[in-house]
Amino acid sequence: CKAMHVAQPAVVLASSRGIASFVCEYASPGKATEVRVTVLRQADSQVTEVCAATYMMGNELTFLDDSICTGTSSGNQVNLTIQGLRAMDTGLYICKVELMYPPPYYLGIGNGTQIYVIDPEPCPDSDF
């Protein structure tokens, strides 16, 4: 297993609709054709694999399990979007990238993106 650098933004604020997007960029040492991306959440004294996708370079990312994640890839960048977030989902979201094929296998783990989620205030009743 060889190490690889992964960069991601330090902080992202989710939209009022509970959607957060960030870019995960990896320094690919070679010409990988198969890449696996996993988003980990580290908070509340637990570590959760939020979503994972394996993709062939140049193709769409396909997430399984009715995933709350979607994403696109462009070169060594993965544009990740997490939806359906609520205030309790606030935490550190870490991007893990694995170059699966061809060998050698490379693994890179980012420092994490702190995603802040604020639940929207309910709209007040109006006479208008």
Epitope: D44, Q46, T48, E49, V50, A52, D66, I68, M88
Partner: nanobody, 125 residues
Framework: EVQLVESGGGLVQAGGSLRLSCVAS?????????MAWFRQAPGKEREFAAA????????SYADSVKGRFTISRDNAKNTVYLQMNSLKPEDAARYYC?????????????????WGQGTQVTVSS
Amino acid sequence: EVQLVESGGGLVQAGGSLRLSCVASAEGSFSTYVMAWFRQAPGKEREFAAAISGRSGLTSYADSVKGRFTISRDNAKNTVYLQMNSLKPEDAARYYCAADRRAWSARPDMGNYYWGQGTQVTVSS
């Protein structure tokens, strides 16, 4: 409605291992359920230990068990497992299997779970 039956608990020495099993009788496909293990020690609140998603096997672990416990599932057998290694006296508790029919999320510890009756794990020092 889901019926959950746990097994595999018992008495083990500190540093030892146990494998818990939970068989589910579920409405619809077992693979659509998020499965989890919680535990409750005497006089303490029930706490999250681990969870696993339906099809792709995404996992979540409490910091207190990560690296020692492994959750897995066999959808063909409607069964979820908790392999517990390097057990400590503080792991002693009643372990509950839980099932939640919803999509995987960033907080699988917070779900609308169906519960089993639990299986007792005792760790002697």
